[in-house]
Each structure stands twice: as C-alpha cells, then as structure tokens.
C-alpha cells in the first residue's frame, strides 16, 4: 500500500490529480466506528469540513482525500482529525507552465557521472491501477520506448543523456482524461573521484637572489577540494620575521578539481636564508608530495647548471 503524505508543506500543479493520505491509516482501520473528518482553512475562511458535496472534484475514501483534479483555489491548510489525532498540511497550488511540458518548481535534479549507471523509471504506485499509458519525454520530445506502461531508461551515462526527463502518466477517472507529470533534471559530469594531487614544476628549484632584496617563491598544485598545501622551512616555522606565507589562491578546473598556489615571500634576504630548504607540501588522503626551493646568491650561479634554475 502507498505510504502516507508526511511532508507538511506540499506544492502541486493545477490540473493534476492529487491526494492527501493521513499517517494513522492502519490505526483508522482498527477503529472503524470513530468519526474521521477532513477540514480546510484558507485566508479568511476558518475550518470548513470537506465532503463529496463540497466539490465534484473531491473524493473521500478510507484514509485519503482525493482531488480530481487539484485547482488554484484549493490552496490552503488541510486537517485530518480522528479522536485525539490530527494531521495538518499546507497545500500550495501553482500555475501550470503553458509553454513547457513541465513546471520548473516541480523538478528533481540529479547529477550522474559519465560512464556510471543511470536510470529513469516512470512509476506511480498510487494511481497505478488507473493509468492507461505512460510516456517519457526528454526536453519535451517524446522518446520511443518499448514499454508504454512503465517506460524505463537503464544505461551507462553519456554526456548526450543530459536533459530534462518528464514521465507523463495518462489516466481516466469518471470518464475524464487526466495526466500526472514527474520531471528529472539530469546533469552528466566528469568522473568525480579523487585525483592523486601533484605539485607543478621541478622537485628541486635553485633560485638566484641578491642579499637585501625580496623574493616570492610560488608553489602550485593540482589537487582535490579537501587537500591542503603548506610551506615548511627552518627549525620552527614563523621564527624568521622576514618570511611570510601569503594567502592561498584556488581556481576550480573544468573537471571539478582545484588549481592551488601558495606564495612564500622572503623579504630583505640575509645569509641565513641562503642554501637552506624551503619545502612546499601538498597533503591528501592518499599521501603527500613535496618540492623544495633553495636560495642561491647570484654571484654563485656559475657553479650550478642552468637547467635547475627557477627565474
């Protein structure tokens, strides 16, 4: 059996069949003789008891209040009362989008990774026995699928699969034709699994400097969102007042990874800054990667092969 309507705030589109089912249904069957009442209140109207005479569009049976169909003026608060049990819903009926096969407010978005399993299944368990046929549309164009009772797509996702998929169930009630639409916005993305972070450039960098001048050491990496990039130098980081770590800069790549750079600024370079390792490390769940910078006096450049220099 279809479960109850538990969400207290419900938005529905005008012109579609709709139902409210209270959540003490099993209990209600046990006490058949108990008075069960449905009420509506909206704006100035206080609680008005609902019954089939209230409107030809309203049907009451067992635990359910049905609308055939729901219309804009059905907006309001609804109450089910039985003995000391009360359940309340706030119903908001919105206008149908006349220019589309679906209404944007009624969309369920899902993000699927390319090559991963992707499925759309058109089912409606409550109205199942009344459904004549069901059609599946992609971007409001009907898809030709074998099963016209429960159309289904099951495949490995490709980028071309991206789009709005609308399941439209057609059903008859009291000689009238109705339809119910359920729409999914499917976005196909690149593989989101984590990469092994990598520091860009050579692992060892000799930087030619002049005493008394400033230098900026730039450390860049391709990494995951949660990975960290940091500098290590000297006995204790921060002991040299001339050394400053600048704020990390991050730019997201089209693949959803991050390009990060962190600058170490050394001001008023002294002898103590020469020939020591300034290490930049990227750390992730999968381990770490480190690259090193060594400051060398410009006069000593001739002793080091040119290809190891970072200008």
């Amino acid at each position: 059996a279809e479960s109850c309507t538990s969400r207290p705030h419900i938005t529905v589109v005008e012109g579609e069949p709709f139902y409210l089912k209270h959540c003490s249904c099993s209990l209600a069957h046990e006490i058949e003789t108990t008075t069960k009442s449905w009420y509506k209140s909206s704006g100035s109207q206080e609680h008005v008891e609902l019954n089939p005479r209230s409107s030809s569009r309203i049907a009451l049976h067992d635990c359910v209040l049905e609308f055939w169909p729901v219309e804009l003026n059905d907006t309001g608060s609804y109450f089910f009362q039985m003995k000391n049990y009360t359940q309340k819903w706030k119903l908001n009926v919105i206008r149908r989008n006349k220019h589309s096969c679906f209404t944007e407010r009624q969309v369920t978005s899902k993000i699927v990774e390319v090559k991963k399993f992707f499925q759309i299944t058109c089912e409606n368990s409550y109205y199942q026995t009344l459904v004549n046929s069901t059609s599946l549309y992609k971007n409001c164009k009907k898809l030709l699928l074998e099963n016209n009772k429960n159309p289904t797509i099951k495949k490995n996702a490709e980028f071309e699969d991206q789009g709005y998929y609308s399941c439209v169930h057609f059903l008859h009630h009291n000689g009238k034709l109705f339809n119910i639409t359920k729409t999914f916005n499917i976005t196909i993305v690149e593989d989101r699994s984590n990469i092994v972070p990598v520091l860009l450039g050579p692992k060892l960098n000799h930087v030619a400097v002049e005493l008394g001048k400033n230098v900026r050491l730039n450390c860049s990496a391709l990494l995951n969102e949660e990975d960290v990039i940091y500098w290590m130098f000297g006995e204790e980081n921060g002991s040299d007042p001339n050394i400053h770590e600048e704020k990390e800069m991050r730019i997201m790549t089209p693949e959803g990874k991050w390009h990060a750079s962190k600058v170490l600024r050394i001001e008023n370079i002294g002898e103590s800054n020469l020939n020591v390792l300034y290490n930049c490390t990227v750390a992730s769940t999968g381990g770490t990667d480190t690259k090193s910078f060594i400051l060398v006096r410009k006069a000593d450049m001739a002793d080091i092969p040119g290809h190891v220099f970072t200008r």
Epitope: C4, S6, R7, P8, H9, R105, T108, S109
Partner: antibody, heavy 121, light 111 residues
C-alpha cells in the same frame, strides 16, 4: 509523528570505518530524500551527501567522495552512512535528516538525534 | 558548487532588539518566482530546527517574530524583537543545486 532514530555513539581508531544507521518511522520513506550532515566540535554544519530511497541514487559532497557510502534498506525504512579511513578530523556529531525530492523542497524539516563519532588512537 | 557567505559570524544584542543576519550565495538560488534558500536555528547539544523555507515561508509552529526575505544571491533573516530563548546559532542553506550547502553560521548572544 515523523521520527528519525539514529544508532548510538561510536569510538573508532584512525584508519578504521564507522557505519551509522538512521531508521525512519511513520512516513513515506521512498518519496523523500535522506541526507547526512555532520558537525565537528565547535564548528558549523557540513552537508555530506544524500540518498534517494526510491532508487538508491546517491550524491556525495566532493570532500567525502570515495570515503562515504550511503545505502538504504527499504524493508526496514533504514538508511546507513559508512565513513572509511577515519582520521581525527572526522570526530563529529553525524545527523541524518530528510527532505522532499524536488529541488525547492530540499530543506530539512525532520532531524535524527545525532550520533557522536569519536576518532582517537 | 554554490558557496554561502553568512554575516556576521557572531553578534550580541539586547532583548527586544531587531536582529538581522545576511547570507550571500556565490550564484543565484532563485528560479521562476521561488528562492531555494532556507534558515535554521541550532541550540547547543541539539539538532538544527527549520525556521524559514523558500526564503520567506515560516515553518509551522515558529513564532512570527522570525522572518526571511531576499532573492537571487542576497538574503536576510530577521528577528523583529529578540527574546532570551532565541540565543542560538543560525544557518542558511541553499537547495538550488547539488551539492547542497550551508552558511558558516551566526552565533547570537544576549548583551
């Protein structure tokens, strides 16, 4: 009326895994999405991911991709969240919470009581 | 991904004061007349509690002194007259797209 009941507190060693359960009662289990939100001590709320019980579709916050696994058992209206390769930063209160399936309705009106997970050597 | 920037991170106010918290999304969270922004209250040791949904709708049972407004990227949460029981941390949350995201929170204290 609607209730989400979570499993009890856990103490784990770094590198281990933890599996937290969340049982839903008295409501349309398969018409709502279930989410996991965590809160480290003294920190804010962090959305971890979601599962649609109707088809087991999952989507994870990139931060937890590959480490978190959300599953559902519709026969018992229970969702599970397993977090592997635990580290001390995973010490937090883990909440399950429910929302509607439409994008507009993905706000959290019912919450579990929270499960404290402590990661310590 | 949509980043949420909430301000201030903390604030101190007196009972009866009007309190305003803002939340800015890194891109629009509004579509066709709806804004997919929601507000929560969290007291120490408790689960968060929904106060406002879809930018301006008051959750059932929440006092009318709480309100929300805004559209696009800029949203405001207001307590018209601060009460002692309102001491808590407040969070905004967007549901325009996955991944869902929260603001970093605003801790509200009584002067």
């Amino acid at each position: 009326q609607v209730q989400l009941v979570q499993s009890g507190a856990e103490v784990k060693k770094p590198g281990a895994s933890v599996k937290v359960s969340c049982k839903a009662s008295d409501y349309t289990f398969t018409s709502n999405w279930m989410h996991w939100v965590r809160q480290a001590p003294g920190q804010g709320l962090e959305w971890m991911g979601t599962i649609d019980p109707s088809d087991s579709y999952t989507y994870y916050n990139q931060k937890f991709q590959g480490r978190a696994t959300m599953t559902v058992d519709t026969s018992t209206s229970t969702v599970y969240m397993e977090l592997s390769s635990l580290r001390s930063e995973d010490t937090a209160v883990y909440y399950c919470t429910t929302s509607g399936d439409y994008d507009a309705d993905r706000y959290f009106d019912v919450w579990g009581q929270g499960t404290t997970v402590t990661v310590s050597s | 991904d949509i980043q949420m920037t909430q301000s201030p991170s903390s604030l101190s106010a007196s009972v009866g004061d009007r309190v305003t918290i803002t939340c800015q999304a890194s891109k629009s969270v509004s579509t066709s007349g709806d804004s997919y922004m929601h507000w929560y209250q969290q007291k120490p040791g408790k689960a968060p509690k929904l106060l406002i949904y879809l930018a301006s709708n008051l959750e059932t049972g929440v006092p009318s002194r709480f309100s929300g407004s805004g559209s696009g990227t800029d949203f405001t949460f207001t307590i018209s007259s601060l009460q002692p029981e309102d001491i808590a941390t407040y969070y905004c949350q967007q549901s325009r797209e996955l991944p869902l995201s929260f603001g970093q929170g605003t801790k509200l204290e009584i002067k």
